[in-house]
């Protein structure tokens, strides 16, 4: 059997702190027996040089004197092979060797799991010289052991170009279970199975896992770590944790919330960011997502006019960036706007409806039936038209803009007249005789100038010509109407 220094197997506190039996600061092995001669403990290793049998790594000195026989082989004395202790306890172990005084400058180094331990370690080497030999004791101490101190420790001494290696001292630090994998929070579909994983390690092993749901243990029998809990499905939110226990005590994982995916809450704070004659830019604050990412949103728009037919326009958009420009709206109109968003489970209810208005726009159509005729007696051109339909004025009519272009013998001159909204006729004075006058009219609102009507041309003769006939906006398809006298 492996020679062990074993502490009594006692559980220790879940959290560090004052607690009966936990304040011991140093640990002296209870057993420190030599190995039987030539015994190499299981689970231990010592690096050896290639081609050399390992018997605790012995160096045979080559130095001989005239009257003396060869010196005996050098080797570290056997010591305790396995020390088991609890986390946060102190431990001290050593290796010793007797070296003939003919050797100078001998140093001992400590190695752990094949790597030299340099600095920041409590290693002390003491020398006890005698007539022929010097006993060297190298001590290594750790004031408060941690799991990372687990491993195989050896001493090495270089002498006469030979390396002497001690038997290993295996340190096993035992403590409460330590989680290597804890359950993770999840969002799951209602009544759908899912798995949670929990893994904890010692030493000491085994580590057993109990699952806890909403403060109730799920399994009567512990499961050896690692453990996977298959939950057949939930209908409401639950908190899960796992409890890992070994012979030192038990440790509790973090509690994780398992949420049930649901339809989202309706968006809140729908607000108007900008309004034009034919569009409204809205933003909203998304509601709670129901533990499932938003996929898209729907903007519902209905005319607020009580005389409207109540039909709803629906505009679909992506869930981000919580902003949407509603287009193709009528000018100077009132609308009710609501927003609804969806996730994988379904659509939210519609947000509280908000009222929004479009602004005045420039008229969308030109005045109709434009007629132009020459009043020769007063040397004026009379213009008549029909108001554009009210629906298409896109605002309150403030007047009209008349463009009249006079062309004669390569000279062209454009003039603009503004007239009030009352009436549907205007009179302009003749600018040039023996010329063509082209007239176009646009309706004007506070929102701007609408499109001009199709051009109507009239020829203004030189003085003394007889009569004239009116010129008017052509029927669709006839371009460039010219009145020929």
């Amino acid at each position: 059997a492996i020679t062990e220094a074993r502490e009594e197997a006692k559980p220790y506190p879940l959290f560090p702190g004052p607690f009966p039996g936990s304040l011991q600061t140093d640990h002296t092995p209870l057993l420190s027996l030599p190995h039987a001669s030539g015994y190499q403990p299981a689970l231990m290793f010592s690096p050896t040089q290639p081609g050399r049998p390992h018997t605790g790594n012995v160096a045979i000195p080559q130095v001989t004197s005239v009257e003396s026989k060869p010196l005996p082989p050098l080797a570290f004395k056997h010591t305790v092979g396995h020390i088991i202790l609890s986390e946060h306890k102190g431990v001290k172990f050593n290796c010793s060797i007797s070296v003939p005084n003919i050797y100078q400058d001998t140093t001992i180094s400590w190695w752990k799991d094949g790597k030299e331990l340099l600095g920041a370690h409590h290693a002390i080497t003491q020398f006890y010289p005698d007539d022929e030999v010097t006993a060297i004791i190298a001590s290594f101490s750790i004031t408060s052991v941690q799991r990372s101190d687990n491993g195989s420790y050896i001493c090495k001494m270089k002498i006469n170009n030979e390396e002497i290696v001690s038997d290993p001292i295996y340190i096993e630090v035992q403590g409460l279970p330590h989680f290597t994998k804890q359950p993770e929070s999840m969002n799951v579909t209602r009544n759908t199975a899912f798995n949670l994983t929990c893994q904890a390690v010692g030493p000491p092993e085994p580590v057993n896992i109990f699952w806890v749901q909403n403060s109730s243990r799920v399994n009567e029998q512990p499961e050896k770590s690692p453990s996977v809990l298959t939950v057949p499905g939930l209908t409401e939110m639950a908190v899960f944790s796992c409890e890992a226990h070994n012979d030192k005590g038990l440790t509790v994982s973090k509690g994780v919330q398992i949420n049930i995916k649901a339809i989202p809450s309706p968006p809140t704070e729908v607000s108007i960011r900008n309004s034009t004659a034919h569009s409204i830019l809205i933003s909203w604050v998304p509601g709670f997502d129901g533990y499932s990412p938003f996929r898209n949103c729907s903007i519902q728009v209905k005319e607020a006019d009580p005389l409207s037919n109540g039909s709803v326009m629906i505009f679909n958009t992506s869930a981000l960036p919580h902003l949407y420009q509603i287009k193709q709206l009528q000018a100077l109109a009132n609308y009710s706007i609501g927003v609804s968003c969806m996730n994988e489970i379904g659509w939210s209810a519609v947000s509280p409806w908000i009222l929004a208005s479009t602004t005045e726009g420039a008229p969308s159509v030109a005045p109709l039936n434009v007629t132009v005729f020459l009043n020769e007696s007063s040397d004026n051109v009379d213009i008549r038209w029909m108001k554009p339909p009210t629906k298409q004025q896109d605002g309150e009519l403030v007047g009209y803009r008349i463009s009249h272009v006079w062309q004669s013998a390569g000279i062209s001159k454009e003039l603009l007249e503004e007239v009030g909204q009352n009436g549907s006729r205007a009179r302009i004075s003749v600018q040039v005789h023996n010329a063509t006058c082209t007239v176009r009219i646009a309706a004007v609102t506070r929102g701007g100038v609408g499109p001009f009507s199709d051009p109507v041309k009239i020829f203004i003769p030189a003085h003394g010509w007889v009569d004239y006939a009116p010129s008017s906006t052509p029927a669709p398809g006839n371009a460039d109407p010219v009145l020929i006298i």
């Epitope: 006692k10 109990f210 944790s241 038990l250």
Partner: antibody, heavy 114, light 109 residues
């Protein structure tokens, strides 16, 4: 389902040694630490000893010199021996799961009398 | 020797809430004491209610809950029922041994 069942003599004489066996089913003793607990008639419960999954043991310090707990994992049995029995040791003896005292045997009543 | 103290008796009306406590002579009770609560009706084996990290044993209704209140372990029973009338023992772990309290006799009036 984990079940524990105690067995042992109903009557022992003073100074004799009591040997009780707890047979575990539904789980391996390599995964389950087992405690022994007793209850004298009309009195409170008293913890006696535990045997750990790894085979280590701990005892009630007042009774330590008289108690030995051991297990045979292959037989799924935990054995408690108590030496030098006295009439005050008359009680119902239970074995139970250790960290959670939630799996108990039905108990075995031991009377110490000459 | 550590002593664990419980109220000798307590009474509660049906449907009422009661909190039983468990004090240690060594000082404040902590999570490291792994407080266990056990229910025992006359002539029956004990039945574990709460253990480990204040988790309910399988099959124990959520009317029973364990906690640490101030420096004591506590067992709270909400919506008390007639069959909750029993003896309740707490057990605290002290590094290498359990210590049981003297028990509380709960009467549901």
């Amino acid at each position: 389902q984990v079940t524990l069942k105690e067995s042992g003599p109903v009557l022992v004489k003073p100074t004799e040694t009591l040997t009780l066996t707890c047979t575990v089913s539904g789980i391996s003793l390599s995964s389950f630490a087992i405690s022994w607990i007793r209850q004298p008639p009309g009195k409170a419960l008293e913890w006696l000893a535990v045997i750990w999954t790894g085979g280590g043991t701990d005892y009630n310090s007042a009774l330590k010199s008289r108690l030995t707990i051991s297990k045979d994992t292959s037989k799924s049995q935990v054995v408690l021996t108590m030496t030098n029995m006295d009439p005050v040791d008359t009680a119902t003896y239970y074995c139970a799961s250790h960290w959670y005292l939630d799996v108990w045997g039905q108990g075995t009543t031991v009377t110490v009398s000459s | 020797q550590t002593v664990v103290t419980q109220e000798p008796s307590f009474s509660v009306s049906p449907g009422g809430t009661v909190t039983l406590t468990c004090r240690s002579s060594t000082g404040a009770v902590s999570t490291s004491n792994y407080a266990n609560w056990v229910q025992q009706t006359p002539g029956q084996a004990p039945r574990g209610l709460i253990g480990g990290a204040n988790s309910r044993a399988p099959g124990i209704p959520d009317r029973f809950s364990g906690s640490i209140l101030g420096n004591k372990a506590a067992l709270t029973i909400t919506g008390a029922q007639a069959d909750d009338e029993s003896d309740y023992y707490c057990a605290l772990w002290f590094s290498n041994h359990w210590v049981f309290g003297g028990g509380t006799k709960l009467t549901v009036l």
